[in-house]
């Protein structure tokens, strides 16, 4: 079997790490390395193009390594910031991987969670239900959710409104 360059499974373009300041940010970097004799496999993170040690933020990186029966290797490095700041949420987080077959990199999509807007829905029986203050955020079409995901969120939102409605009776 021919060895190939490393493959980064995570982060990817389909997952957005949306956090509020004060929350913990956890970003896994999962890389598959096909077996190659004497190859030095490496995985590392850069933050704003720099080594995490050179950035004045409290960041920890934990690594785990697993091997398949064919001696292929999967390395996972989890970058974690215990209490993320709004400044941290604007930084560029890039996972890099290198083997004798080549070097690859992928950026994590990190964003600050926008507080859900408050809005009022006029219910048939005359009560007004206010949503958006709690529960799931209003779906953001930019987050790359597929239509099923959006439907799930809309359904959940409808249930919240429904419960709110009955709560008034």
């Amino acid at each position: 079997k021919n060895a190939v360059p490393p493959v980064i499974h995570s982060p990817n373009d389909h997952v957005v790490y949306e956090k509020e300041p004060g929350e913990e940010l956890l970003i896994p970097c999962t890389v598959y390395f096909s077996f190659l004799m004497d190859s030095r496999n490496e995985v590392w993170w850069t933050i704003d193009g720099k080594k995490p040690d050179d950035i004045t933020i409290d960041v920890t990186i934990n690594e785990s390594i697993s091997h398949s029966r064919t001696e292929d290797e999967t390395r996972t490095q989890i970058l974690s910031i215990k209490k993320v700041t709004s400044e941290d949420l604007k930084r560029s987080y890039v996972c890099h991987a290198r083997s004798a077959k080549g070097e690859v990199a992928k950026a994590a999509k990190v964003k600050q969670k926008v507080p859900a807007p408050r809005y009022t829905v006029e219910l048939a029986c005359g009560f007004g239900a206010t949503g958006g203050g709690s529960g799931k955020p209003i779906p953001n079409p930019l987050l790359g959710l597929d239509s099923t995901g959006l439907n799930d969120i809309f359904e959940a939102q409808k249930i919240e409104w429904h419960e709110h409605h009955h709560h008034h009776h």
Partner: antibody, heavy 121, light 107 residues
Framework: EVQLQQSGAELVKPGASVRLSCTSS????????MHWVKQRTEQGLEWVGR????????QYAPNFQDKATITVDTSSNTVYLQLSSLTSEDTAVYYC??????????????WGQGTLVTVSP | DIQMTQTTSSLSASLGDRVTISCRAS??????LNWYQQKPDGTVKLLIY???TLHSGVPSRFSGSGSGTDYSLTISNLEPEDIATYYC?????????FGSGTKLEIK
């Protein structure tokens, strides 16, 4: 394909203002900080500033704090650079560019073709 | 601001030559250095980032090295399309700063 298309050359009078545009295609502008640099004839590149199109937050090099204003119109995927109180020192080619990776990475991979601004009476 | 000095403003070499372009920072920049190529028509391209990482699509005849304050870009086998001006750029400290450029010409 990532493309940055800048507006055409400008000839402006001293003391006036000018607004340059940079229209992007092939990517979501909200995903990348957008930057501008200045290049005077036979001189190096000088970083002007950048904008986060997601929320409009800007940052400028100290030399351009009172000279440049960067704005964005996400609906048209366009970033603007406004230069005010123009003098002959502002005569230069201005480039917009985008980082290689999502957000604010410092590896400037995609550049516009440049806009020449000439300040002359 | 960190000053980036490219002492050789122009360089003349023959096709096939190995060419080295140097760049010096006014303080240690911890390898946070990129190289750009600007063609005579004004087109700018990223060649190398973080001192030695080749940007995708850049020919392997380009390589970068250095540490501390001294960095270099090497073209191992000069081709006609390499005629351009080369700029170094540091991102160690704000604001990002660029060298004044080294113009490469064919003998």
């Amino acid at each position: 394909e990532v493309q940055l298309q800048q507006s055409g050359a400008e000839l402006v009078k001293p003391g006036a203002s000018v607004r340059l545009s940079c229209t992007s295609s092939g990517f979501n502008i909200k995903d990348y900080f957008m930057h501008w640099v200045k290049q005077r004839t036979e001189q190096g590149l000088e970083w002007v500033g950048r904008i986060d199109p997601e929320d409009g937050e800007t940052q400028y090099a100290p030399n351009f704090q009172d000279k440049a204003t960067i704005t964005v119109d996400t609906s048209s995927n366009t970033v603007y650079l406004q230069l005010s109180s123009l003098t002959s020192e502002d005569t230069a080619v201005y480039y917009c560019f985008r980082p290689l990776y999502y957000g604010n990475s410092p590896w400037f991979a995609y550049w516009g073709q440049g806009t020449l601004v000439t300040v002359s009476p | 601001d960190i000053q980036m000095t490219q002492t050789t403003s122009s360089l003349s070499a023959s096709l096939g030559d190995r060419v080295t372009i140097s760049c010096r920072a006014s303080q240690d920049i911890s390898n946070y250095l990129n190289w750009y190529q600007q063609k005579p028509d004004g087109t700018v391209k990223l060649l190398i980032y973080y001192t030695s990482t080749l940007h995708s699509g850049v020919p392997s005849r380009f390589s970068g090295s250095g540490s501390g304050t001294d960095y270099s870009l090497t073209i191992s086998n000069l081709e006609p399309e390499d005629i351009a001006t080369y700029y170094c750029h540091q991102y160690s400290k704000f604001p990002p700063t660029f060298g004044s450029g080294t113009k490469l010409e064919i003998k």
